[in-house]
Amino acid sequence: CRTSECCFQDPPYPDADSGSASGPRDLRCYRISSDRYECSWQYEGPTAGVSHFLRCCLSSGRCCYFAAGSATRLQFSDQAGVSVLYTVTLWVESWARNQTEKSPEVTLQLYNSVKYEPPLGDIKVSKLAGQLRMEWETPDNQVGAEVQFRHRTPSSPWKLGDCGPQDDDTESCLCPLEMNVAQEFQLRRRQLGSQGSSWSKWSSPVCVPPENPPQPQVRFSVEQLGQDGRRRLTLKEQPTQLELPEGCQGLAPGTEVTYRLQLHMLSCPCKAKATRTLHLGKMPYLSGAAYNVAVISSNQFGPGLNQTWHIPADTHTEPVALNISVGTNGTTMYWPARAQSMTYCIEWQPVGQDGGLATCSLTAPQDPDPAGMATYSWSRESGAMGQEKCYYITIFASAHPEKLTLWSTVLSTYHFGGNASAAGTPHHVSVKNHSLDSVSVDWAPSLLSTCPGVLKEYVVRCRDEDSKQVSEHPVQPTETQVTLSGLRAGVAYTVQVRADTAWLRGVWSQPQRFSIEVQVSD
């Protein structure tokens, strides 16, 4: 037989069916020009010493072979003895190691068998009613195709599916969408309506994420508030990476999960913008305010479940940084200014009450005064901090108040509102004899003592009603008792107590009269 012809003789090797899983497969035969044809196949297994034979049985029932040697592609003309206008059955027999391996056969009419391409270029993936929809442009001059897909997950083998007949400039396929695992898809096409036409090669992998992006398993820590009033949020644990099928490992466009950080600044609710979304890789600096932080995972199908953390406010206070002066027109606060053209947010809330009851006020951008101070004033009528109780005050600053991550904490402190000097007056002052020339004075703690850092000291005043001499005794803010000594028996005294803040002198308590009785000896 001539090598260019199909040989109508018994094949030149004995029959010894191997029954092995390896061997030739994916035989494709098609016309490549007006009078030439090509068959190609793949061989799975060791290729050393393998000889391939393309077998053909004609519609007449006569059978022949082409010897391909070690090649897995063979071309022949319409003069090779194979009828191209009638149906033929073709398969490959590979002779290796004294055994024969056979490919699945294809039955087709060669003249009408066109080499079909798999979907080329961009395959668009979308979600439609809980299924996956793939769409692509039909390869040139190949309208009219049957399309198949195969898909696998990281833990499952290939499964075959059918896309049905296609007859348009764009082709599409509905495929199953997995809820929680990534999938790899490949597509192939063959000529529609041409009995037994060969399938194209499989397309490049299409990598598809699960419908639900994986929930981010991350942990945060927040650093101490720095001198600049900011603290860094750091990621302690990176999100777990999605497991990918074999063909999607390495570069897998389509399966990317993006993690975004959503910051919600809970403090200072009167500012313009309360939330900001950032990429997880870019960890922000935060003020000392309270925040809710959510990590949102999303893929090409949209966002998934998020994980939320609460970052509590930094409660470190600076008792001396804030000056408050109370005048007839109202109250003014002074604090060291941060920089030029700063917007300040002053937030206050009664101590011991829910954070939701915080009130705040936003200043217009202001420059420091000649003393380098920033100020905020309010009138008595405004009602701000008007009740006689302890308030927690925080001042935040920003040169760009519309940018959530550029706020910093200026100070946090406590302030007693209303008429603090009167409200702070100690009550229940009592005097007890202590010795022949001394007494013990006790009083109930001032309301100011409920406000950390506000009560600077108590002052106890003792007045000798005879000589009108007055002595004053400072007492630590944590004490509510003092011993007055050097007193004379039989003399009338009055005692009063007041509570002072750093910027306000308190109001004296009601005078309490007492005397030490003269001791008469028997």
Epitope: D10, D15, G19, C57, C63, T89, W91, E105, T107
Partner: nanobody
Framework: QVQLVESGGGLVQAGGSLRLSCLAS???????MGWFRQAPGKEREFVAA????????WYADSVKGRFAISRDNAKNTVNLQMNSLKREDTAVYYC??????????????????WGQGTQVTVSS
Amino acid sequence: QVQLVESGGGLVQAGGSLRLSCLASGRTSNYFMGWFRQAPGKEREFVAAISRSGGGTWYADSVKGRFAISRDNAKNTVNLQMNSLKREDTAVYYCAADRRTGTSVYTVDEYDYWGQGTQVTVSS
């Protein structure tokens, strides 16, 4: 060793139908399968053949359009549906397996394994 057992033969009136079945013991999905017949005093002749996957089918001119060969590899069976039977279809029908596929699908000598046959009688 493959064993083939035919069934479904019998007596039928001309113009009637019969369905012959061939059950193989052993895996025959890698073999071409065929049906042959032998009338009394005549040589065994080719009736129909089918390729391994069932994609390729071949028929003798005398039965084309009346007979249909099919196979079910999962069940290891090959069937021959015979319609519009004629008196000249009377014969013993044999199932055969060709493990090699040499130069033709219709040559008796190509086939390696044979069944015992089933009688088909078409009366007028």
